[in-house]
């Protein structure tokens, strides 16, 4: 018996087609992805093959103005239209709190939404009961297939699930649910979830009875043969894990942003054992036409987005200096504003010993692309912010050793004075540079804001300590020459859309007046630009 698994993960609000790098589509003939194009390919496969499941491994939420405006209603509407068979909850599904998950998505989805390792307690238990499930048995042709869901147990640090959801260890929670499926005589079981490739492989190895793992969260690109676009494969598709009980378990993921449709064919014997598995992600490029009816629906929903982007979010009473003459040479108040917004977006009081789990932010000055003039009645719109942050990135959470941070700050000024983008803007950090010293030895003071304290204060950076830092995904991926971050980071979790983070902060503050306040200093009276 053959099953075709179509899968997506980490789509992050890319409802419309995008450019090759998943930012805004400029030249339509070279654009990719989007739900209209995805629907064309899914329908083509459904017509050609008998037993097809379309699965999503979480993080549909968050990533573009679509989510900012529609808050998840767009996810339910278009996933229903595409007739997804099941979805696992990702960490970003909790970005607008539990209510922001229940009302737009859990209540409106026409397909099961799954997670076995999230347990509700207190008053939420009865409110959310039945709205998401640990597993679902799906009828496929004359057979049944069990889908068991899982979600990153780091979600309380990455999103806003509140205090009435407990995120258990994935493997511990999955095993009894898989065992339950076995007692129901379900002998073909897919683990569908959102905890990253390393956990996906562990689940394949450790959870007895799981036949296939379909994952997300780490945006992992797997491919067999010559890859069709810019993504470099982390391994073959499917990635085969030998389980502790000796079975070969295929593990798959389909990069992110709806650029690819994962396509995995599994052959089962009559006892539900996997005989063979093969496939590859399908690049959703312009050779696949966009479905006209879904496209028309997208265009109808789009209208509200254009109206939103010109509405006032809040006001500034000071000039927001995002000029390259400032942000690439010294502390600029636009950099301070953005970093303050980044920290504010990551306030999670999950431990009494810590005022917050993260206090530090770094931001490449080259990522700040425009100032905002306060002389326009102080008005700040989404459109204004999109000029400041035009690349459609995210502000991510990483864990780094102090020694890596020191290297990053040395890199920040290694060729100072050439208006290069690597000059770092900061939050929760005080840095002093001496430009008279040779490159690689210019950081003379680096103090960081404590987290395990009731009164936050600045302490010298410790080289061997592990620190959490919020930074643009561009830096986490080694951009602007920050190879040391990419190579040495200990953990990386994708965060919220950059513009959304700043716009939420401005809306919350109502009136802003960021200052230049001595976060970055130069000693030795060295002349600088």
């Amino acid at each position: 018996w053959e099953l075709t698994i179509l899968h997506t993960n980490d789509v992050h609000s890319r409802l419309e087609q995008t450019s090759e790098d998943s930012s805004k589509c400029v030249n339509a003939s070279r654009c990719m992805g989007g739900v209209a194009r995805l629907f064309t390919k899914v329908q083509q496969i459904r017509r050609a093959e008998p037993n097809v499941l379309l699965l999503d491994a979480g993080d549909q939420y968050q990533g573009t103005i679509w989510f900012t405006v529609y808050k998840g209603a767009e996810v339910a509407h278009f996933m229903n239209a595409l007739r997804y068979d099941a979805m696992a909850l990702g960490n970003h599904e909790f970005d607008n709190g539990v209510e922001g998950l229940i009302e737009p998505l859990l209540k409106e989805a026409k397909f099961p939404i799954l997670s076995a390792n999230i347990k509700a307690k207190g008053p939420l238990a009865s409110q959310i009961s039945g709205l998401y499930l640990p597993y679902k048995v799906l009828p496929v042709g004359d057979e049944v297939v069990g889908i068991v869901g899982y979600t990153s147990k780091e979600t309380p640090f990455l999103s806003n699930p509140g205090t009435n959801l407990v995120f258990e260890d994935e493997i511990t929670a999955l095993q009894p649910e898989v065992d339950k499926l076995k007692t129901l005589n379900v002998n073909k079981i897919i683990a569908l979830g959102h905890s990253g490739f390393e956990m996906d492989k562990l689940i394949a190895q450790k959870v007895r009875g799981v036949d296939v793992v379909v994952g997300g969260h780490s945006n992992t690109f797997l491919y067999t043969g010559n890859p069709p676009s810019k993504e470099v494969p982390a391994g073959k598709y499917p990635f085969i894990v030998t389980s502790d009980d000796g079975r070969k378990v295929p593990v798959v993921q389909a990069y992110a942003f709806g650029k690819y449709l994962g396509y995995l064919k599994i052959e089962f014997d009559e006892r539900g054992n996997v005989i063979s598995s093969h496939g590859n992600p399908i690049l959703l490029n312009s050779s696949i036409p966009e479905d006209p009816s879904i496209k028309a629906d997208i265009n109808k929903w789009r209208i509200k987005l254009d109206n939103y982007s010109t509405q006032e979010l809040g006001k500034t009473i000071v000039y927001l200096d995002g000029s390259s003459q400032s942000c690439r040479f010294r502390e600029c108040n636009m950099g301070n504003l953005i970093c303050d917004a980044m920290i504010n977006n990551n306030l999670r009081h999950t431990d009494e010993m810590f005022w917050n789990h993260v206090s530090m932010c770094i931001l490449n000055g080259g990522g700040i692309r425009s100032p905002i003039d306060e002389r326009n009645n102080g008005t700040i719109t989404w459109e204004n912010l999109a000029a400041v942050l035009p690349f459609g990135g995210t502000f991510d959470l990483v864990q780094l050793k102090g020694s890596t941070l020191k290297k990053a700050f040395e890199h920040s000024v290694h060729r100072y004075g050439q208006s290069t983008g690597e000059f770092l803007q900061v939050g929760g950090i005080h840095v002093v540079y001496d430009l008279s010293r040779k490159p690689g030895d210019r950081v003379v003071k680096l103090d960081v804001l404590c987290t395990k304290c009731r009164v936050p204060s600045y302490d010298p950076l410790k080289m061997d300590e592990v620190y959490k830092v919020i930074l643009p995904n561009f830096l986490a991926n080694g951009g602007d020459g920050f190879q040391m971050i990419k190579d040495e980071l200990l953990r990386h979790d994708s965060g919220d859309q950059d513009i959304n983070v700043v716009s939420t902060y401005i809306s919350k503050m109502k009136v802003i007046y960021p200052a230049v306040e001595g976060r970055i200093k130069f000693s030795h009276h060295h002349h600088h630009h």
Partner: nanobody
Framework: DVQLQASGGGLVQPGGSLRLSCVVS????????IGWFRQAPGKEREGVSC????????NYADSVKGRFTISRDNAKNTVYLQMNSLKSEDTAVYYC?????????????????WGQGTQVTVSS
């Protein structure tokens, strides 16, 4: 919380009719496929009929085809099973079940929520 309550059972003579109702609460019926199942003493549970979430697809066991009709009234949050030309072998406890999914299936294991049963006895 998803709850289902089956009613309308009773004692009826062979050749007679009954209409079973399944009232659902705690969710929007529109998004759920509903199935009717029955279990006679000493026998395995049997999938009798189902109606998919859009109401456009129905399915019946061979043993009831042409005699039973399933329908849904989403405004009343109710699914009905009209049973005509009843036979003694239709005697059983009848249950309704719900699953949030598009497709109609008479396999019991695919349903997530179950109602209390209602007894149907066909006897002269």
């Amino acid at each position: 919380d998803v709850q289902l309550q089956a009613s309308g059972g009773g004692l009826v003579q062979p050749g007679g009719s009954l209409r079973l109702s399944c009232v659902v609460s705690g969710f929007t019926l529109d998004y759920y496929t509903i199935g009717w199942f029955r279990q006679a003493p000493g026998k395995e549970r049997e999938g009798v009929s189902c109606i998919n979430s859009s109401g456009g697809v129905t399915n019946y066991a061979d043993s009831v085809k042409g005699r039973f009709t399933i329908s849904r009234d989403n405004a009343k949050n109710t699914v009905y099973l009209q049973m005509n030309s009843l036979k003694s072998e239709d005697t059983a406890v009848y249950y309704c079940a719900a699953q949030k999914y598009y497709y109609c299936s008479r396999k019991g294991e695919v349903y997530d929520s179950w109602g209390q049963g209602t007894q149907v006895t066909v006897s002269s």
